[in-house]
Interface confidence: medium
């Protein structure tokens, strides 16, 4: 028979044949052959793989570093990574929660929608068209672009979500 060019779900193609992927929580030891199944082994303590895979090494569980204010929210298993969170009163700087801050700053291009309180973190929002923020701040809202017209000037450079417009003198020449 013709060797396959594609395999079913949860299989992979190797040496012109389809082998079963290893299930989550297990790593690949050896590929299947004409006569043998794929050989897989469970991940060790403090390791995981969260997908059907052909990885030869499991991933290390995330370390929740107390020096960064982190603690374990959910212990990892052979199929899931450890989930970190921050100590009481601190907030994660990102979705991945790699470090903690007393309250988060909004990056350039984002403004503060709601200032942090004792229980909730800063809420940021993207600056809409016509507004900008050029600083990283835990307090500043998006600022409106300068209105060149009210200063009897014209826009020389368009504004962005991170920069104000640049105004310049009107061209005095008239046709």
């Amino acid at each position: 028979p013709e060797p396959p060019t594609a395999c079913r779900e949860k299989q992979y193609l190797i040496n012109s044949q389809c082998c079963s992927l290893c299930q989550p929580g297990q790593k690949l030891v050896s590929d299947c052959t004409e006569f043998t199944e794929t050989e897989c082994l469970p991940c060790g303590e403090s390791e995981f793989l969260d997908t059907w895979n052909r990885e030869t090494h499991c991933h290390q569980h995330k370390y929740c570093d107390p020096n960064l204010g982190l603690r374990v929210q959910q212990k990892g298993t052979s199929e899931t990574d450890t989930i970190c969170t921050c100590e009481e009163g601190w907030h994660c700087t990102s979705e991945a929660c790699e470090s903690c801050v007393l309250h988060r700053s909004c990056s350039p291009g984002f403004g503060v929608k709601q200032i942090a309180t004792g229980v909730s973190d800063t809420i940021c929002e993207p600056c809409p068209v016509g507004f900008f923020s050029n600083v990283s701040s835990a307090f500043e809202k998006c600022h409106p672009w300068t209105s060149c017209e009210t200063k009897d000037l014209v826009v020389q450079q368009a504004g962005t979500n991170k920069t104000d417009v640049v105004c310049g003198p009107q061209d005095r020449l008239r046709a």
Epitope: E87, S99, V101, S105, E140
Partner: nanobody
Framework: EVQLLESGGGLVQPGGSLRLSCVAS????????MQWVRQAPGNGLEWISA????????YYADSVKGRFTISRDNSKNTLYLQMNSLRAEDTAVYYC?????????WGRGTLVTVSS
């Protein structure tokens, strides 16, 4: 290396005033929003005030609004906190901070004790 040195703390009676100072070095002071944070005995850190890099915009926690005033002198790389109408619950170690990361550099703080 970032350094923040707070001073001005001490023992004061309820209703009294104090002015805290924080001298900064090791970074371009006027580029940064600066903050005052405090920690009362046995409590977590409490953010109390912040000021924009140019000094034009100030922010306060409800617990100190109307009593405390934050200011800065960028020519002297110094942050200030004027504290009026002090109460017993204002007793804490006061820190100035450049950023509020758990691992960021914090000064050693200055102790404010409000007691009769």
């Amino acid at each position: 290396e970032v350094q923040l040195l707070e001073s001005g703390g001490g023992l004061v009676q309820p209703g009294g005033s104090l002015r805290l100072s924080c001298v900064a070095s090791g970074f371009t002071f006027e580029w940064y929003e600066m903050q005052w944070v405090r920690q009362a005995p046995g409590n977590g850190l409490e953010w109390i005030s912040a000021i924009s890099g140019d000094g034009y915009r100030t922010y306060y926690a409800d617990s100190v609004k109307g009593r405390f005033t934050i200011s800065r002198d960028n020519s002297k790389n110094t942050l200030y906190l004027q504290m009026n109408s002090l109460r017993a619950e204002d007793t804490a170690v006061y820190y100035c901070a450049k950023e509020l990361g758990y691992f960021d550099y914090w000064g050693r703080g200055t102790l404010v004790t409000v007691s009769s």
